[in-house]
């Protein structure tokens, strides 16, 4: 397994609708035709997998139908969007990139993007 540099923003603020987007960029050490991208969430020293997708160059990233993630790819950049976030989902979201084909296998893990999610205030009842 060979190491590869992965860059991602340090901080992102989710929208009021609970949507957060960030770019995950990897420094490909050579030709890559198949790439696997995994988003990990680290909170309280626990790491869980949020979503993952394998894509062949020239294709869109396809996450599972029930995934909270969507994404697009362009060259060595992956634009990731996570939706349905609540305040309790605030945490460090780490981008992991694997170059699956052709060999050799490369693995890169970003430093993480701290996503802050603030639940919207409920609207006060209005009298008409």
């Amino acid at each position: 397994c060979k190491a590869m540099h992965v860059a991602q923003p340090a901080v992102v603020l989710a929208s009021s609708r609970g949507i957060a987007s960030f770019v995950c960029e990897y420094a490909s050490p050579g030709k890559a035709t198949e790439v696997r991208v995994t988003v990990l969430r680290q909170a309280d020293s626990q790491v869980t997998e949020v979503c993952a997708a394998t894509y062949m160059m020239g294709n869109e990233l396809t996450f599972l139908d029930d995934s909270i993630c969507t994404g697009t790819s362009s060259g060595n950049q992956v634009n990731l969007t996570i939706q349905g976030l609540r305040a309790m989902d605030t945490g460090l979201y780490i981008c992991k990139v694997e170059l699956m084909y052709p060999p050799p296998y490369y693995l890169g893990i970003g430093n993480g993007t701290q996503i802050y999610v603030i639940d919207p205030e409920p609207c006060p009842d209005s009298d008409f």
Epitope: A27, S28, G30, K31, T54, M56, M57, G58, Y101
Partner: antibody, heavy 119, light 113 residues
Framework: EVQLQQSGPVLVKPGASVKMSCKAS????????MNWVKQSHGKSLEWIGA????????SYNQKFKGKATLTVDKSSSTAYMELNSLTSEDSAVYYC????????????WGQGTSVTVSS | DIVMSQSPSSLTVSAGDKVTMSCKSS????????????LAWYQQKPWQPPKLLIY???TRESGVPDRFTGSGSGTDFTLTISSVQAEDLAVYYC?????????FGGGTKLEIK
């Protein structure tokens, strides 16, 4: 010795579909991508797409999306390409070509399948 | 898509002559990550499938005679045959191997007098 044995020539009517095969031997089928290449008579080569025989994921040249469908049968080490809604423009020789084991460029080719579309 | 352009489209030479043919790509095939050029050369003889001659712009495929030499970097590449033999009668194609979609040049047809 790596061998890619392709199915024989076909004559089909416009609007029909055709499915050709490429049987691989002499290596581990699931380890290397299989590419498909089109060559119209007297013309250059066009890359149609590639498939990963391990999981069936594929990538297509935009020009051939909707025209070609790539599949594999791991149990028989065979790759397939289906072409649909055929027109005279699809008359050509179609090659399967394996990614090489050292440099991952197309270094082993089938003998080609000739497709003629005519009414 | 990367466009590959080859010249000349055809040339006629005598056995023993030195031949050079050119291939240009619309964007660089030099990968910044490993400094490799992702360009391949193929030879296609009449009624046969293409055969890989050169990969990585300059590395000869196993079994290819050393009279075939590939050179160049970035967007400009050359295939040289130092002393043409009768069996070299073929069409020679260059191919962008940098990434999908792979693209080929229009070919250079080599004919022997």
């Amino acid at each position: 010795e790596v061998q890619l044995q392709q199915s024989g020539p076909v004559l089909v009517k416009p609007g029909a579909s055709v499915k050709m095969s490429c049987k691989a031997s002499g290596y581990t089928f699931t380890d290397y991508y299989m590419n498909w290449v089109k060559q119209s008579h007297g013309k250059s080569l066009e890359w149609i797409g590639a498939i990963n025989p391990d999981h069936g994921g594929s990538s297509y040249n935009q020009k051939f999306k909707g025209k070609a469908t790539l599949t594999v049968d791991k149990s028989s080490s065979t790759a397939y390409m289906e072409l649909n809604s055929l027109t005279s423009e699809d008359s050509a020789v179609y090659y399967c070509a394996r990614d090489g084991s050292i440099h991952y460029v197309m270094d082993d080719w089938g003998q080609g399948t000739s497709v003629t579309v005519s009414s | 898509d990367i466009v590959m352009s080859q010249s000349p489209s055809s040339l006629t030479v005598s056995a023993g002559d030195k031949v050079t043919m050119s291939c240009k790509s619309s964007q660089s095939l030099l990968h910044s990550g490993n400094q490799k050029n992702y360009l391949a050369w193929y030879q296609q003889k009449p009624w046969q499938p293409p055969k890989l001659l050169i990969y990585g712009a300059s590395t000869r495929e196993s079994g290819v005679p050393d009279r075939f030499t590939g050179s160049g970097s970035g967007t400009d590449f050359t295939l040289t045959i130092s002393s043409v033999q009768a069996e070299d009668l073929a069409v020679y194609y260059c191919q962008n191997d940098y990434g999908y979609p792979y693209t080929f040049g229009g070919g250079t047809k080599l004919e022997i007098k």
